[in-house]
Interface confidence: low
């Protein structure tokens, strides 16, 4: 038999200890939140908030401007000064809870933990390719804010998620805040609200619609808002909350909340339980039917998918899919599965399940005993009755009240447990050619860029590298500018190319040339690299013969 070269084991064809240096910025304190802006005249910026300060960076992470956002009561606080002469409330540090772009103006809106959670609007002032912030406007009108009714109290110190939607000439802020009894009593933020930014930038219009955890449940029932996004006709919030109102705090699970993006109303507020599981190929004896549950969402991102993954998910290429990283939760017993799993929920399918849930609740014949749910927000009732009523009302429609859909949406880990001990703390998904790539940050300060494919029994890495030596967890917020993603870890912001930081971690020519085309890898004498790194011959088509 003819002699053949021995095969190089797959794991030996790559080295994830290879060091990559990516551009970074030291913010001078723990990065709290971050957002990017790309204008239509090639101007762009990265906005980075730390305690008491907001940095404006260029796309190259060079500092353009810095603004003092606290401490409240300090004469050096530049945002506080926009509210006129104080005092405006208790003094103290400002932790930025909300940093979002208002696309219509355009402007940056920041909301902090101080000054009753009020927000500041910073008009964007393009100067060449750089962006500066104009003097801030204080989004607070003292005369129409009271402790029990405060349209301008937006951010909760326990965490707030905001998505901004343009409706006609107005900008609406879809706001979701975590509450407890103390926060609810101090400056009355709401759990979920839709607030219209006043045209004169003096705050938010009074009389806004809102849902709040009922006072009797505030102590035991806390909702963490993990992510929010807008796609199609809806705004979505993702939450981690107790599975039961009566057993709260108890076991946690994940829900998707859907709100209309075309109507600033909460009558069509819907919730759906998201169920993510790890289902090993061979089920161990005693392992749960349907797979091991991973009920707690850590991070999420929605993105259109490439052709390959779309085929595996039985959806059309380019359709929007919600990706979530889930963990098992504290009370899940001894873990035999991976630390993190990733599940994919096509948005169209989520919408259909919600619409079907409305149909079950509101279309006759209604299944007896079907509850409307959301008893932490509203009085208990059975379908099709409105909350708190024991019979349908002739003047009101069943569909015009919040509803928890009675079925959950169950998916299994896309990675088949292959993330193993990796603890994922950040996620951003992109479509590159016909491939869908998950860009993940980890608890030990690494970046994993992995092709999303369901059918493989190994991970298709674009890269797996350490951001630095600090080993600090990569934070939840990830932003994109052009062909780069911005991750934060500790007090640093890092710029990571979507195509990966390089090719040097591929050790063999065969492995190098099998890398995805978008990575731009080629064989360069005795190493894998990109063409500009190779002074000599660079080959993408075939490998030299092994001697």
């Amino acid at each position: 038999k003819e002699w053949q070269c021995p095969r190089t084991p797959y794991a030996a064809s790559r080295d994830f200890n290879v060091k990559y240096m990516v551009p970074s910025f030291s913010a001078g304190g723990l990065v709290q939140t971050m957002v990017t802006y790309q204008g239509d005249k090639n101007e762009s910026a990265v906005f980075v908030a730390i305690r008491n300060r907001l940095h404006v960076l260029g796309p190259d992470l060079k500092s353009v401007q810095s603004l003092a956002t606290g401490p409240a009561g300090d004469p050096g606080c530049q945002t506080c000064a926009a509210c006129g002469p104080g005092p405006h409330g208790p003094s103290g540090d400002t932790d930025t809870k909300v940093l979002v772009l208002e696309p219509a103006l355009p402007a940056l809106v920041s909301c902090g933990s101080s000054l009753q959670g009020r927000c500041f609007l910073h008009d964007l002032d393009p100067q060449g390719t750089a962006v500066h912030l104009a003097a801030p406007a204080c989004l607070f009108s003292a005369h129409h804010n009271r402790p029990d009714d405060c349209p301008d109290c937006v951010a909760s110190p326990l965490g707030t998620r905001v998505t901004v939607v343009e409706q006609g000439q107005a900008s609406y802020f879809y706001v979701a805040s975590s509450l407890d009894a103390a926060v609810a009593a101090s400056f009355s933020p709401r759990s979920v609200s839709i607030r219209r930014l006043k045209a004169d930038a003096s705050g938010f219009a009074p009389g806004f619609v809102a849902l709040s955890v009922l006072p009797k449940h505030l102590v035991s029932y806390s909702i963490e808002y993990v992510h929010s996004f807008h796609t199609g006709a809806f705004v979505y919030f993702l939450t981690v909350q107790p599975a039961s109102v009566t057993d709260a705090p108890g076991a946690l699970h994940t829900r998707l909340a859907r709100l209309s993006a075309t109507e600033p109303e909460l009558g069509d507020y819907r919730e759906l339980v998201l169920d993510c599981r790890f289902a090993p190929k061979r089920r161990r004896r005693g392992a749960p039917e349907g797979g091991q549950p991973y009920p707690v969402l850590r991070v999420a991102h929605s993105a259109p998918v490439g052709a390959q993954l779309a085929t595996e998910l039985s959806i059309a290429e380019g359709q929007e899919v919600l990706f979530g990283v889930f963990v098992a939760g504290k009370d899940s017993g001894p873990g035999v599965g991976p630390n993190s799993v990733v599940c994919a929920f096509p948005i169209d399918l989520l919408d259909t399940l919600i619409d079907e849930g409305v149909e079950r609740c509101c279309e006759s014949p209604v299944h007896p005993g079907l509850r409307r749910g959301l008893d932490f927000f509203q009085s208990p009732s059975f379908c099709p009755n409105p909350p708190g009523l024991e019979a349908p009302s002739p003047n009101t429609s069943c569909r015009h009240f919040p509803l928890l859909v009675s079925s959950s949406f169950s998916r299994v880990d896309l990675f088949n447990g292959l993330l193993g001990t990796v603890e994922v703390t950040a996620l951003y998904v992109t479509r590159l050619d016909n491939v869908t790539v998950a860009h993940m940050g980890t608890a030990d300060g690494r970046i994993l860029q992995v092709e999303l494919a369901r059918s493989l029994n190994y991970l298709l890495y674009v890269s797996n590298f350490s951001l630095g030596d600090s080993g600090q967890p990569v934070q939840r917020d990830v932003s994109r500018l052009g062909d780069h993603l911005f991750f934060a870890s500790g007090d640093q912001v890092f710029q990571v190319p979507i195509q990966g930081p390089g090719c040097r971690h591929f050790l063999t020519c065969g492995r190098c040339l099998r890398a995805q085309r978008f990575m731009g890898c080629g064989w360069c004498g005795n190493m894998c690299g990109r063409q500009k790194e190779c002074p000599g011959s660079w080959q993408q088509d075939h490998c030299p013969p092994k001697l």
């Epitope: 006709a233 809806f234 209309s260 075309t262 109507e263 109303e265 009558g267 069509d268 959806i315 096509p346 169209d348 399918l349 919408d351 259909t352 399940l353 619409d355 079907e356 409305v358 429609s397 569909r399």
Partner: antibody, heavy 123, light 112 residues
Amino acid sequence: DVQLQESGPGLVKPSQSLSLTCTVTGDSITSDYAWNWIRQFPGNKLEWMGYISYSGSTSYNPSLKSRFSITRDTSKNQFFLQLNSVTTEDSATYYCARGGFYYRYAGPGFAYWGQGTLVTVSA
Amino acid sequence: DVVMTQTPLTLSVTIGQPASISCKSSQSLLYTNGKTYLNWLLQRPGQSPKRLIYLVSKLDSGVPDRFSGSGSGTDFTLKISRVEAEDLGVYYCLQSTHFPLTFGAGTKLELK
């Protein structure tokens, strides 16, 4: 019982705007459902034009581009069609109809129709 | 847009005899929720259309059970087991799975 009644001019000149009204009785246009306009050309071809939902959001057939809009007057329980820059090709019988309550689509077909109003576009 | 093709365009029948109309769509009408939004409408002479069948096979209230609908994916059929005089008119299929909603060209059911 739910009833829909179309009304408007039977004759419109080319390049002018066509405005039609659909008056609904037996149901409130804010209570549920999508309220649609459909037209039938000579020769019987039917075309779905668009809807306004119970909440006031609208959805239009892309083939009508930006010439077409639907509005409503909830106090009169009416919804309206406006078609701008009409040509002879817009001559048809125009129907209003009630659809399902889905956000994206008019739901499972059209259960209730008006009797239709014939519109002729001619100089 | 989804094209709905009906055959035949005219169907001549005798009262009391069965009739069958076919409707084919240019793409599958199966929606992601497992439902197929295919409807059949009848337009009697001088009247507005009236829905007979929705979700492929569900009869509207008041529609006689001599009407039945069947099919899946892209191929659908409306059957009348015994034609009566009141059944004469033009039958249309309508899809509401995909945006925009589209109708078939119609099948005229007339007396032989």
